[in-house]
Amino acid sequence: KEEQTTFRDCAEIFKSGLTTSGIYTLTFPNSTEEIKAYCDMEAGGGGWTIIQRREDGSVDFQRTWKEYKVGFGNPSGEYWLGNEFVSQLTNQQRYVLKIHLKDWEGNEAYSLYEHFYLSSEELNYRIHLKGLTGTAGKISSISQPGNDFSTKDGDNDKCICKCSQMLTGGWWFDACGPSNLNGMYYPQRQNTNKFNGIKWYYWKGSGYSLKATTMMIRPADF
């Protein structure tokens, strides 16, 4: 059997025998275009493709539509993998989405969606989610049904305001909704009573800005 040399996601990499967490090169489905991603090969059985990470405020997440489309930041630290890649990937097969959260008091929680995919750019990378479980709230902090993605230069929310400009960061804003993991990073002691922070309402409420977040995906049949 010929050894696989290109990989669509971290699950394929894991199954090939590469089981060390780190930065790997992924290839777009049905293409030779490549992208670098961080693979978590330890958490929950491994094989997770990290599509978002916040941890220290080192990267500005108030970016343009194009930047959110192609990705930005550093896969070893804070980054956004890119809506186009995630959209193409999650329309190839069924993926689960796990969102891991940390607060400033040392607590951790997660939300797991058993089915996740993004629509194409023509449909504004609308998010589709089903089947929530986990410890970060019994109600989804990503509004259901899913909303279109919005950025500071691409206003697709359901508010007469511009949520992305007001709350900062690109996200699937409703009007403006109970979450924004791409909001302004606030350090410890300045992370409360902040309307534009890193928010996951059904875990920490509206004014609490989180310490760290990771969004990761993996095929449902992994």
Epitope: G57, M184, Y185, Y186, P187, Q188, R189, Q190
Partner: antibody, heavy 121, light 106 residues
Amino acid sequence: QVQLVQSGAEVKKPGASVKVSCKASGYTFTGFYMYWVRQAPGQGLEWMGWINPNSSGTNHAQKFQGRVTMTRDTSISTAYMELSRLRSDDTAVYYCARDQDIATAGPFDYWGQGTLVTVSS
Amino acid sequence: EIVMTQSPATLSVSPGERATLSCRASQSVSSNLAWYQQKPGQAPRLLIFGASTRATGIPARFSGSGSGTEFTLTISSLQSEDFAVYYCQQYNNWWTFGRGTKVEIK
């Protein structure tokens, strides 16, 4: 009255470390966060980090990642800031300053007199 | 990081006159802004916090105003001891200072 008294001036060679002390009096040392701010010659003020004297928890500016260590000794109400791998552009007056209000992470109401650290070969 | 821009860099004023110093934040800092006075060879001294509240012992001739991104420090009638460098500082998201405005005798 509240007083923050810092250690004396230091001259260090590039690559060396310096440890500046800040002795607090006139208030409950563990009740207020202590900050460190530096000012290069003729320049503005730059926040370096803070320490919670009660828990010894710290937070520092990313710029100083891996180079700054903040500690405290509650028995003598003293906070310390150690900066390692010194470079010439670390030449500055280093201040300790007290948080005005533990709840707001706000402005600094009391300052030490400053410690001049000169880095020169 | 939030960048604080102070203007003017130098302000020449005669004693008894009013001085108006400006500070602009690169993004909203709400009212989490302070003003400090610093004289040569001395540590900064807190004048104003919360954008407009005078610190303990600060004379009434010092007043602060503004919120969001635009702030002003006004010294209504300059005294000889007021000639110094003034810094604004935001404490909404990390802690950053402006580069200072030097108030000198005209």
